[in-house]
């Protein structure tokens, strides 16, 4: 299934993009999945469809649910699903985990924090930024286009950062906020030839046909901030984005973790609705930095659904 999670706060604007793509000339219809009722396109409605976008202006808790989008080409229809959850505003300062976008890491050399989902909205600079609910003040903080730059980053700069902006729709203004965590990487350290912790070389992973499967590529690169380090998956020697199989996707953003003081990265490969042909592919976990590249190959094998042992 082509499904995407989206969330927002009540009385704020929320704009969701259809997970299925198409050409500009294709029409897109939106429906409430439960009732199959068409979502209007007239902008006078609080919830309305605008091509590939579904707009909640503003959102209400009752809007939560699954929405279906159908991208109609002249000869074929592509269906996607948007799983939308609208939450009540919290009275206290804490932003719950379910409202957080992906964590970003920064260092003294690179301290950009991008405002999540902002590209979907009609907004004008400047953005307002808050850290742990306090408005950011001082010359160290610079709001630039859709991101925040922090000069001379220190470990104390770690925390939850919220961007706030105004979406304009036909002269009406709606507030939008989005929060993500920012972690600070230690500048002191060293770099090693990548060490892949998982998967093992030539590992065989058992999967069930028709079910979802996850493969994690995890590697460590040294201690402290790494100038260049990446982990990624390849299919038959091809980047995931170039392979063109929408069921197989890398998890957005790399997770940074520190194991025994080591700087490690992991990338999850998600395979939706495993098919027979997926068993024929070669899955390569690649870890690379300035020292070089290490590759571990994984293959999938069919797991008998009634076979419960690990």
């Amino acid at each position: 299934k082509f499904s995407k999670q989206s969330w927002g706060l009540e009385n704020e604007a929320l704009i969701v993009r259809c997970p299925r793509q198409g050409k500009p000339s294709y029409t897109v219809d939106w429906y409430y999945s439960q009732t199959n009722k068409s979502i209007p396109t007239q902008e006078r409605n609080r919830v309305f469809a605008s091509g590939q976008l579904l707009k909640f202006l503003p959102a209400a808790v009752a809007d939560s649910g699954i929405y279906t989008c159908i991208v109609r080409s002249p000869t074929f229809n592509r269906t996607g699903y948007a799983n939308v959850t609208i939450y009540k505003k919290q009275s206290d300062c804490n932003v719950p985990d379910y409202l957080m976008y992906s964590t970003v890491s920064g260092s003294e050399k690179n301290s950009k924090i991008y405002c999540p989902t902002i590209d979907l909205y009609n907004w004008t600079a400047p953005l307002e930024w808050f850290k742990n609910c306090q408005a950011l003040q001082g010359s160290r903080y610079r709001a630039h286009k859709s991101f925040l730059v922090i000069d001379n980053v220190m470990t104390e700069d770690a925390g939850d950062y919220t961007c706030k902006f105004i979406h304009n729709e036909n002269g009406a203004n709606y507030s939008v906020t989005a929060t993500r965590s920012f972690t600070v990487k230690d500048e002191q350290g060293f770099s090693l030839f990548p060490v892949i912790g998982a998967p093992a070389q030539n590992e065989i992973k058992e999967v069930e046909i028709g079910k979802n499967a996850n493969l994690t590529c995890s590697a460590c690169f040294g201690k402290g901030t790494q100038f260049l380090a990446a982990v990624l998956w390849q299919l038959n020697g091809t980047k995931i984005t170039d392979f063109g199989e929408p069921r197989i996707q890398q998890e957005e953003g790399q997770n940074q973790s520190f194991s025994n003081g080591l700087a490690c990265l992991d990338m999850v490969l998600r395979i939706a609705d495993v098919k027979e042909e997926d068993l024929l592919l070669q899955y390569d976990c690649l870890a690379l930095n300035l020292h070089g590249l290490r590759r571990h190959t994984v293959r999938l094998s069919r797991k008998n659904p009634i076979d419960h042992h690990s």
Partner: antibody
Framework: QVTLKESGPTLVKPTQTLTLTCTFS??????????VGWIRQPPGKALEWLAH???????QYNPALKSRLTITKDTSKSQVVLTMTNMDPVDTATYYC????????????WGQGTTVTVSS | DIVLTQSPASLAVSPGQRATITCRAS??????????MQWYQQKPGQPPKLLIY???NVESGVPARFSGSGSGTDFTLTINPVEANDTANYYC?????????FGQGTKLEIK
């Protein structure tokens, strides 16, 4: 610069399976909206659409030939492969691959074509 | 299937004159207000070349002498003025429904 090139056997025997490869450059079949199709033209006759495949692996076939056709893509190699089973002398034709690009659905770039003769 | 009927089957035109080829579809090729009809030129030993897309849009690099018109089921390709190197077969093609279909072709000869 967009280019497409067809390759495959020039002669096949009746009942055999024909496998044609279209190798392209100048665009990616992972780009939203892109497609690659196959068209054939018997000597002195009109063009006939066979099949095409889209960026998201949606495949469409000519219903008259669907049972005999399979189209696949290898995005990493920039290739699209068409197989046609149970070949017959009436399948003798020049086979073209073409890109479906632009804001609408049509063939905007064509390969030079490859001539396939079916004969025992 | 949508059947495309071209007329005439062949025509001969003097240089500098106008050539008109028509294509009639067995049903409408309209989609969201757009006519999904193309015109291709094919010279001997060469692949087809796109001239006109969605009924009236001239493909980049194609001389302005070529124009397309029509909507629904009736479409026209006009070449004005005709030049000696326009000798070729011309095909209309619809992409409104699968199977995509082509006309039987019109052979243009220059007198």
């Amino acid at each position: 610069q967009v280019t497409l090139k067809e390759s495959g056997p020039t002669l096949v025997k009746p009942t055999q399976t024909l496998t044609l490869t279209c190798t392209f450059s100048g665009f990616s079949l992972s780009t939203s909206g892109m497609g690659v199709g196959w068209i054939r033209q018997p000597p002195g006759k009109a063009l006939e659409w066979l099949a095409h495949i889209w960026w998201d692996d949606v495949k469409q076939y000519n219903p008259a030939l669907k049972s005999r056709l399979t189209i696949t893509k290898d995005t990493s190699k920039s290739q699209v492969v068409l197989t046609m089973t149970n070949m017959d002398p009436v399948d003798t034709a020049t086979y073209y691959c073409a890109r479906i690009g632009g804001d609408y659905d049509y063939f905007d770039f064509w390969g030079q074509g490859t001539t396939v003769t079916v004969s025992s | 299937d949508i059947v495309l009927t071209q007329s005439p089957a062949s025509l001969a035109v003097s240089p500098g004159q106008r050539a008109t080829i028509t294509c009639r579809a067995s049903e409408s090729v309209e989609y969201s207000g757009t006519s999904l009809m193309q015109w291709y030129q094919q010279k001997p030993g060469q692949p087809p070349k796109l001239l006109i897309y969605v009924a009236s849009n001239v493909e980049s690099g194609v001389p302005a002498r070529f124009s397309g018109s029509g909507s629904g089921t009736d479409f026209t390709l006009t070449i004005n003025p005709v030049e000696a190197n326009d000798t070729a077969n011309y095909y209309c093609q619809q992409s409104r429904k699968v199977p995509w279909t082509f006309g039987q072709g019109t052979k243009l000869e220059i007198k």
